[in-house]
């Protein structure tokens, strides 16, 4: 029922206003102008984005499960936002914990050699039967973001005349016959079809793909960043280890592929104020327009400190713009002096290729512990994971609409294959909510000083962070 407010007495209007003020505490606000779609609705719940007809409807909405859940999340968010700034001792303790973890959980040069030897051995085995193929190590082993137990990612480069599925079937047969490998199986239904086996000597799991060029390019990019930016590798290792502790890094179980965590760290370092990493494309490129960023394709790493790009004007955006321009020209009076914006842009984009630096000129002075905390805060409070896309190519924040990707869960753009959301394996809302909740718990845990025996906490123990960052020492500060 809609009340005719003009007929209310002053006392009744006071009562209504009082009720509305109370509703505001629950994030339900009176609409100044009614929405054309919801003409009967007088109120809007800003938390749940729901239109509500009247006060009674608002009281009913407040009791709903989703509203209560959103209220709790909002309360937790404001609690997290009001956490005190960490002391320098706290940050120093965090820095030590991250460095120790990187040493303890990351792979050493010896571990890397073992992994390279595995590829060498496998090359010999496979090339005996397929001499035109070559094998290369890629993924976390090469970037040095691998944890000691991480799989060994191997890709087979093969000539165009060979058939991809047939090749993998042959590889499956070859490895099955070899005494060097056990538990040889195929996983041809995976997003990237692979042959999986265990190296008998090292007991490491190997995942053998074929023609996985994009993954190799991403590997090269991340490996180069690890070499030029000292904080990158320890941050990625800490982030990956945290994800492993929380069981959110298993792609097959609906989690996030492990290299996504490296892209997330990279994106954070680009977006923080001031940034510690540059974006890969930007206004330093003559004729660059963020609206037409897909005309610029990343092509790989050069000199270990630049990313190569190419301008390709035959992309879909160009065709659309030309079509629009032609339509506009047809509607215009003839005028030879007039140049459309598209003409200018086409001329401006003179540079057909170039390279972008992977580092900023100013050296980083930010303590590692502070960056770890900022990273958790960024994904807990500052960056709306459901709304935007994690895109390391440009400084502008991309919305889901920009990419035509649905508005939910996590979207991470593959910098070398821009139509791919590399986090699409996280496809359950429940898992997404668990990931968000883990971020909150982690930020709370690391933002609050921890005592040696562990803090007495009123938090639900099941919700507490599973294990501390370093298995040697708990984070401690004065």
């Amino acid at each position: 029922t809609v009340i005719d407010e003009s007929a209310l007495t002053p006392e009744q209007r006071l009562g209504l206003k009082q009720a509305e003020e109370r509703l505001e505490r629950d994030h339900i606000f009176r609409l100044e102008k009614r929405s054309p779609e919801y003409t009967n609705c007088r109120y809007l719940c800003k938390l749940c984005l729901i239109h509500i007809e009247n006060i009674q409807g608002a009281h009913k909405h407040i009791k709903e499960k989703r509203h209560k859940k959103n209220i709790l999340e909002k309360q937790e968010e404001s609690e997290l936002r009001s956490l005190p700034s960490p002391s320098s001792a706290h940050l120093a303790a965090l820095s030590v914990a991250v460095v120790e973890l990187a040493k303890e959980q990351g792979i050493t040069d010896d571990d890397l050699r073992i992994r390279q030897d595995i590829v060498e051995e496998m090359s010999k085995v496979i090339m005996t039967f397929l001499p035109e193929c070559s094998l290369r190590l890629y993924g976390s082993s090469l970037t040095k973001f691998a944890l000691k137990s991480s799989d060994v990612n191997i890709d087979i480069k093969f000539p165009p005349k060979m058939n991809h599925p047939d090749l993998l079937i042959q590889v499956l047969g070859i490895l099955k016959k070899s005494a060097l490998y056990i538990d040889v199986e195929s996983d041809f239904h995976a997003k990237v079809p692979v042959v999986v086996c265990k190296d008998r000597k090292s007991a490491l799991l190997c995942r053998v793909s074929a023609g996985n060029d994009m993954a190799c390019l991403t590997t090269d990019l991340l490996a180069a960043l690890g070499k030029v930016e000292p904080v990158f590798t320890p941050l990625v290792l800490a982030f990956r280890y945290w994800a492993k502790l929380c069981y959110i890094d298993s792609q097959t179980d609906g989690g996030i592929p492990s290299y996504c965590f490296a892209l997330m760290v990279m994106f954070f370092l680009q977006q923080r104020k001031p940034p510690l990493l540059p974006c890969l494309l930007g206004s330093w490129i003559e004729g660059f327009d963020p609206k037409r960023m897909d005309d610029f394709q990343l092509k790989g790493i050069v000199e270990e400190k630049f990313v190569k790009w190419e301008y390709n004007s035959s992309s879909a955006t160009e065709k659309n713009l030309i079509a629009d321009e032609n339509k506009a020209k047809a509607d215009e009076p003839k005028d030879d002096t007039k140049k459309t914006e598209t003409d200018n842009q086409s001329n401006a984009a003179k540079a057909k290729h170039g390279k972008s630096p992977l580092t900023l000129e100013a050296p980083n002075q930010v303590p590692l512990g502070q960056l770890w905390l900022e990273l958790l805060k960024f994904y807990t409070l500052d960056f709306a994971l459901e709304e935007y896309v994690i895109c390391v190519r440009i400084q502008d924040i991309l919305t889901r609409e920009n990419k035509n990707w649905p508005k939910r869960r996590i979207a991470i753009e593959d910098p070398f294959s821009v139509k791919r959301n590399v986090a699409r394996s996280l496809n359950s809302q429940l898992v997404y909510e668990y990931v968000v909740e883990r971020f909150r718990a982690a930020y709370r845990y690391f933002a609050c000083p921890q005592k040696k025996g562990g803090n007495k906490s009123t938090m639900d123990p099941k919700k507490k962070e599973k294990g501390k960052l370093s298995s040697k020492k708990p984070v401690k500060s004065d």
């Epitope: 009562g15 206003k17 009082q18 009720a19 109370r22 505490r25």
Partner: nanobody, 118 residues
Framework: QVQLQESGGGLVQAGGSLRLSCAAS????????MGWYRQAPGKEREFVAG???????YYADSVKGRFTISRDNAKNTVYLQMNSLKPEDTAVYYC????????????WGQGTQVTVSS
């Protein structure tokens, strides 16, 4: 338990002014409305003025332009400034506070007498 203590009432000549105060003690929650009512002998209690926690004010037509309600949230106190008083304003003035949200006002003071002589 909430106690409301009114003060400032008295005898005043027509055209004069008075300022009533009402201090609330006990558990007063944010978002409580506070108001003033009055009851003249042989008449029903009537609404005079009210103010929400956010500061929105409402007046009975008979007092609009002459009375001003205000509040000090820090002190949990509500005031009623009464100017250009008329003999028909003579009544016992009651302070009221809203806590439960079910009734508009659910706690009432003892009242303070205001007499306007002609």
């Amino acid at each position: 338990q909430v106690q409301l203590q009114e003060s400032g009432g008295g005898l005043v000549q027509a055209g004069g002014s008075l300022r009533l105060s009402c201090a609330a003690s006990g558990t007063i929650f944010q978002s409580t409305a506070m108001g003033w009512y009055r009851q003249a002998p042989g008449k029903e209690r009537e609404f005079v003025a009210g103010i929400t926690f956010g500061g929105s004010t409402y007046y009975a037509d008979s007092v609009k332009g002459r009375f001003t309600i205000s509040r000090d949230n820090a002190k949990n106190t509500v005031y009623l400034q009464m100017n250009s008083l008329k003999p028909e304003d003579t009544a016992v003035y009651y302070c009221a506070v809203s806590l439960s949200g079910v009734e508009l006002f659910d706690y009432w003071g003892q009242g303070t007498q205001v007499t306007v002589s002609s």
